[in-house]
Amino acid sequence: YTSTAQPCPYPMAPPNGHVSPVQAKYILKDSFSIFCETGYELLQGHLPLKSFTAVCQKDGSWDRPMPACSIVDCGPPDDLPSGRVEYITGPGVTTYKAVIQYSCEETFYTMKVNDGKYVCEADGFWTSSKGEKSLPVCEPVCGLSARTTGGRIYGGQKAKPGDFPWQVLILGGTTAAGALLYDNWVLTAAHAVYEQKHDASALDIRMGTLKRLSPHYTQAWSEAVFIHEGYTHDAGFDNDIALIKLNNKVVINSNITPICLPRKEAESFMRTDDIGTASGWGLTQRGFLARNLMYVDIPIVDHQKCTAAYEKPPYPRGSVTANMLCAGLESGGKDSCRGDSGGALVFLDSETERWFVGGIVSWGSMNCGEAGQYGVYTKVINYIPWIENIISDF
């Protein structure tokens, strides 16, 4: 007695797939595989398959039902912080070859990494034209101010909304200041936050306000304080610089905007007699902390002249270092003062039309605005590698 095995039905490839190998007929133990076109994937029911092979059985049936080749779907794209995503191919279309466009919130944010155009690729990931699978980044635009220029020296004026949107008020022990960098860092003076270096959460950080005592402000809290390793408390003010990492990003608007860090070319805007602007709630001529944010436009002072001014007692020799810059009038009267510590001395980069931080309010004579004495500021350009390392590492 002999019997012949039944041939199996000819396998019809699913849409967007093909059968391999192609044979005239398929008999016992013959097999075929299904391969999907690029951008399609094997599905059995709702379950994805890595591969599919069916074997012809003795009774003339295949051992597995035919799968489907279903179009790859990258799914809804991730939200972009401070930005948006647009569907370009069609509303909500997220399948193979669909295009989406990320963009950043106008005016206050700019896109980093790529152009924001992503395509749904065959691997199921949204991919940029550069091949990146990660989201682009919306970085805050820095150095925007309602003030168009520093202009001539004219001190002790009240600031108006949007004039110094990077200004940060730091409370915690004493009143100090800082300047917003990016959307989650504050640049300040080491001496202003030294006591809180191990208790960052004790710092009460306020921004987006002009009035020191106003209940209307944006609250931020500190996650960590980074004091320059070269700073020695109570032994001069060399390396008087610190960074505060905020525990949350702040929302950027016309009243809260970061200050720019100086470019390599920044020194050309910070030469002797160039005008910088210091702002803060520090002591005024009346001897009290200012209620309203004040600012003063002051010229850069020749470094040797400043060094000489602080060579005589009661100042120890070498008080003014190469990591400092000085600003003020020889005749006095225009200066930063106690309570302004940590605030930014800013300059207008006329090429980019953005304000940048050239100095950090650090120290000066016992009597603010004294003739023949100058305000001394930490020279920020000397610390760009340090700032960039801290920010990238943390």
Epitope: Y40, S70, P91, V93
Partner: antibody, heavy 116, light 111 residues
Framework: DVQLVESGGGLVQPGGSRKLSCVAS????????MHWVRQAPEKGLEWVAY????????FYVDTVKGRFTISRDNPKNTLFLQMTSLRSEDTAMYYC?????????WGAGTTVTVSS | DIVLTQSPASLAVSLGQRATISCRAS??????????MHWFQQKPGQPPNLLIK???NLESGVPARFSGSGSGTDFTLNIHPVEEEDTATYYC?????????FGGGTKLEIK
């Protein structure tokens, strides 16, 4: 509370024009694609047009292409539908709806009647 | 354009019983991960309200007596047990491709 409020409906003569508005509140308008959907009296629903969150792309049903224009003003949280060369078959309740992947929030609608 | 055929056009169901509405698409509206079919409820004088998105995902705030199933071209909306307030017209809608289209609607009446 998320809300969409349409306005601008009314009686229009055939061949006439009308501009519908939809004011959004309670959400970040600039983050969402928006649609217009219409419903003729005692009839079913018909999708009319879509505009992406930043106005980069827009799509229309064939019957209104070249006659209707969807636009938006993100700072003012407002969606628009400019309708021209209106026909009697455009008579309907017009709804604006939020969503890129589905119509997740709807306004109460505004009625447009095209009649001489 | 993708045509969605809903059935039945109307149905009457006794309070507490199951209502089943079908929707058939003229072509597949499913990808490897999602089905682009949604269900809406519309009561007289009101705008539609999203019940179920992507075939089977209940929209937040919608009672659990509503459920959806299906993939490819065949989809079903189930309501069990039906309540008085479920009297409405139900629409299926696809967002697979432009133009987005709706089914003709199913009018549900509670007996």
């Amino acid at each position: 509370d998320v809300q969409l409020v349409e306005s601008g409906g009314g009686l229009v003569q055939p061949g006439g024009s009308r501009k519908l508005s939809c004011v959004a509140s309670g959400f970040t308008f600039s983050s969402f694609g928006m649609h217009w959907v219409r419903q003729a009296p005692e009839k079913g629903l018909e999708w009319v047009a879509y505009i992406s969150s930043g106005s980069s792309s827009s799509f229309y049903v064939d019957t209104v292409k070249g006659r209707f224009t969807i636009s938006r003003d993100n700072p003012k949280n407002t969606l628009f539908l400019q309708m021209t060369s209106l026909r009697s078959e455009d008579t309907a309740m017009y709804y604006c709806a939020r969503g890129d992947r589905n119509f997740e929030v709807w306004g109460a609608g505004t009625t447009v009647t095209v009649s001489s | 354009d993708i045509v969605l055929t809903q059935s039945p056009a109307s149905l009457a169901v006794s309070l507490g019983q199951r209502a089943t509405i079908s929707c058939r698409a003229s072509q597949s509206v499913s990808s490897s991960r999602y089905s682009y079919m949604h269900w809406f409820q519309q009561k007289p004088g009101q705008p539609p309200n999203l019940l179920i998105k992507h075939a089977s995902n209940l929209e937040s705030g919608v009672p659990a007596r509503f459920s959806g199933s299906g993939s490819g071209t065949d989809f079903t909306l189930n309501i069990h047990p039906v309540e008085e307030e479920d009297t409405a017209t139900y629409y299926c809608q696809q967002s697979w491709e432009v133009p987005w289209t709706f089914g003709g609607g199913t009018k549900l009446e509670i007996k």
